[in-house]
């Protein structure tokens, strides 16, 4: 016959938010302050993450879930669970070891994070450039030149760059 897990292990009855206290005859004890257990049957509670310095608290720790951090204004999250905060740059720039640098000609960054990327090569798809690229914006591709009506201008000047543009995610 098949024994249930609870008969084999009294700790399996301890719900999330508690731990199986070996010092108290395997009684389910609540997690102490600043600790949590997100699953049942745990023998210890985990210490809550603390959001300090450039990190700020996005979600408070509870007895059943860890705290979640994000970054203070001017910084954005990197890594799983926002393990690091990286400085924002302006649109049209990228972060280098020497700080924020403008995108080189032919590249753009429409966000406050990430790298400068080459303008899209519209001809890859048999299209033409409809709107020129800038440091802050990619080109906009349009129909191939053959699709344009005679006399129609194929390239529009870029739209003026504006903040905030693409918000940091």
């Amino acid at each position: 016959f098949e024994r249930t897990r609870s008969l084999q292990d009294p700790c399996s009855n301890c719900p999330a938010g508690t731990f199986c206290d070996n010092n108290r005859n395997q009684i389910c004890s609540p997690c102490p302050p600043n600790s949590f257990s997100s699953a049942g049957g745990q023998r210890t509670c985990d210490i809550c993450r603390q959001c300090k310095g450039v990190f700020r608290t996005r979600k408070e720790c509870s007895s059943t879930s860890n705290a979640e951090c994000d970054c203070t204004p001017g910084f954005h999250c990197l890594g799983a669970g926002c393990s690091m905060c990286e400085q924002d740059c302006k649109q049209g720039q990228e972060l280098t070891k020497k700080g924020c640098k403008d995108c080189c000609f032919g590249t753009f960054n429409d966000q406050k994070r990430g790298i400068c990327r080459p303008w899209t090569n519209c001809s890859l798809d048999g299209k033409s450039v409809l709107v020129n690229g800038t440091k802050e914006r990619d080109v906009v591709c349009g129909p191939s030149p053959a699709d344009l009506s005679p006399g129609a201008s194929s390239v529009t000047p870029p739209a003026p760059a504006r903040e905030p543009g693409h918000s940091p995610q």
């Epitope: 990430g114 790298i115 890859l124 990619d138 080109v139």
Partner: antibody
């Protein structure tokens, strides 16, 4: 021609996860953004996030940051979206889309994948 | 996030009618405004991008206009195959956002 073919409908229990795939063909997969968009029953369209397959750079709508994980496999020209901790509110049609030749519009749409969350 | 307010939410028109749908952005989005058609079978198609540009193969009866915050989508002469829901979408700022849609029916 450019095509995005999505995986089939899924029925999941609350709390489970689901991974939806989007197989691209007819173009250079690494050169275009892939977006994911959802449509709940009787509702409008919501942008979840996107990925640039060349370097797997992602953007997420803050609303879906803890719900969706977007990845891409260059070797198979396939993008994926995994949805975790499913709830009944996640019941929707999920679309993958490709940009038109810069990220600002979505020219090609997959056929949609229906994800139903029900106990 | 940029809010996109689309109106009307539904409309009924006759074949041959001129149909106009409007979309208003909560902040300036320059010309980064697109229009999509979703057929009853749920397939979605880009019709107009960058406010005024029709995708190749899109019938000339579909057009778009506007700039900044106010945009208009027009079907100059409604055809039976135009039965669909139409959505506007801003591509200016992440997260990209859509209007709530306009369901178009034939009288």
């Amino acid at each position: 021609q450019v095509q995005l073919v999505q995986s089939g409908a899924e029925v999941k229990k609350p709390g489970a996860s689901v991974k939806v795939s989007c197989k691209a063909s007819g173009y250079t997969f690494t050169s275009y953004w892939i977006n994911w968009v959802r449509q709940a029953p009787g509702q409008g369209l919501e942008w979840i996030g996107n990925i640039y397959p060349s370097d797997s750079y992602t953007n997420y709508n803050q609303k879906f940051k803890d719900k969706a994980t977007i990845t891409a496999d260059k070797s198979t020209s396939t993008a994926y979206m995994e949805l975790s901790s499913l709830r009944s509110e996640d019941t929707a049609v999920y679309y993958c889309t490709r940009d038109y030749g810069s990220a600002y519009s979505m020219s090609t749409w997959g056929q949609g994948t229906t994800v139903t969350v029900s106990s | 996030d940029i809010q996109m307010t689309q109106s009307p939410s539904s409309l009924s028109a006759s074949v041959g009618d001129r149909v106009t749908i409007t979309c208003q952005a909560s902040q300036d989005i320059s010309n980064y405004l697109n229009w999509y058609q979703q057929k009853p079978d749920k397939t979605v198609k880009l019709l107009i991008y960058y406010t005024t540009r029709a995708r190749s193969g899109v019938p000339s009866r579909f057009s778009g206009s506007g700039s900044g915050t106010d945009f208009t989508f027009t079907i100059s002469s409604l055809q039976p195959e135009d039965i669909a829901t139409y959505f506007c979408q801003q591509g200016d700022t992440l997260p990209y956002t859509f209007g709530q849609g306009t369901k178009l029916e034939i009288k």
